[in-house]
Interface confidence: medium
């Protein structure tokens, strides 16, 4: 089991240290927005801070966002699905309730 969640999509209007402007953050670097991170990474919450994490690949578990404001702050977030992929219910995954169904990154 893995209880990370998806990127929450909000960005903060804040100033970054000059160091962050000169070099893009690698995996694990603390960030405030996805533009702080290197290619293939996004800025996602990892509880103590937001850090650069890999954008999800095909077949990887993702979290489908419900309506904005329908849940509290997510402590551990996953990135969004990579280009050409969307977060959809895994076809062979059967669960009792709709909300608990496993979502994965799938080709459009």
């Amino acid at each position: 089991g893995n209880d990370h969640s998806t990127l929450d999509g909000y960005s903060r209007r804040t100033t970054l240290s000059s160091k962050m402007y000169h070099s893009k953050g690698q995996e694990g670097s603390v960030c405030l927005r996805s533009s702080d991170c290197a290619t293939g990474l996004c800025c996602a919450r990892h509880f103590w801070s937001k850090i650069c994490k890999p954008v999800l690949k095909e077949g990887q578990v993702c979290t489908k966002h419900r309506r904005k404001g329908s849940h509290g702050l997510e402590i551990f977030q996953r990135c969004y699905c990579g280009e050409g992929l969307s977060c959809r219910i895994q076809k062979d995954h059967h669960q009792a309730s709709n909300s608990s169904r496993l979502h994965t990154c799938q080709r459009h």
């Epitope: 970054l16 160091k19 995996e27 603390v30 405030l32 990892h46 103590w48 801070s49 850090i51 551990f76």
Partner: antibody, heavy 112, light 112 residues
Framework: QVQLLQSAAEVKKPGESLKISCKGS????????LHWVRQAPGQGLEWMGW????????NYAQNFQGRVTMTRDTSISAAYMELSSLRSDDTAVYYC?????WGRGTTVTVSS | QSVLTQPPSASGAPGQRVTISCTGS?????????VHWYQQLPGAAPKLLIY???NRPSGVPDRFSGSKSGTSASLAITGLQAEDEADYYC???????????FGTGTKVTVLG
């Protein structure tokens, strides 16, 4: 439930090295970063660094660079923190934390 | 020397309200990094009280609340109880140190 089990208390002499362990259970060990935080007697909390349990990548606090090494063994869901050239002011309780969950701490005494 | 400053102590009678401040700078709290609060009972590991500035984990009473404004944050305890007697620490990230930092800590005493 999430648990972080730390190794037993240790007594060391100045100049020696220390290696303590933190074994995770009840969660997907490679999916998280593990941090090490220490607390000297009667003092506050001091962050030492983190290890990415998946890749093994590390980031150490400036105060400990060159003296600390963090490693992990995903096959047994364990992380390790090694501190070299011990001094008396390294006497502290050393905690491992997944950020939201903490181990109970390992008491380390450095004395000649 | 911690970059997050807290008052060394705070006190109140049972049922009263106590507020603890955590003052930082433009390289930590003021830069937009989140503030978390921990409670540490004597001889125990820190326990998460507030995360992401103002969010309460499940199991933490609603007597505890957190807020953040500018370069500082605060923790409020309303309806103070005897079991709230503990040390409280704020925590954030500091971009100039490239590391996580804890506040100096505040000892809360419940009077009489």
């Amino acid at each position: 439930q999430v648990q972080l089990l730390q190794s037993a208390a240790e007594v060391k002499k100045p100049g020696e090295s220390l290696k303590i362990s933190c074994k995770g259970s009840g969660y997907d060990f490679p999916g998280y970063y593990l941090h090490w935080v220490r607390q000297a007697p009667g003092q506050g909390l001091e962050w030492m660094g983190w290890i990415n349990a998946n890749s093994g990548a590390t980031n150490y606090a400036q105060n400990f660079q060159g003296r600390v090494t963090m490693t992990r063994d995903t096959s047994i869901s364990a992380a390790y923190m090694e501190l070299s050239s011990l001094r008396s002011d390294d006497t502290a309780v050393y905690y491992c934390t997944r950020e939201d969950h903490w181990g109970r701490g390992t008491t380390v005494t450095v004395s000649s | 020397q911690s970059v997050l400053t807290q008052p060394p102590s705070a006190s109140g009678a049972p049922g009263q309200r106590v507020t603890i401040s955590c003052t930082g700078s433009s390289s930590n709290i003021g830069a937009g990094y989140d503030v978390h609060w921990y409670q540490q009972l004597p001889g125990a590991a820190p326990k998460l009280l507030i995360y992401g500035n103002s969010n309460r984990p499940s199991g933490v009473p609603d007597r505890f609340s957190g807020s953040k404004s500018g370069t500082s944050a605060s923790l409020a305890i309303t309806g103070l109880q005897a079991e709230d007697e503990a040390d409280y620490y704020c925590q954030s990230y500091d971009s100039s140190l490239s590391g996580y930092v804890f506040g100096t800590g505040t000892k809360v005493t419940v009077l009489g």
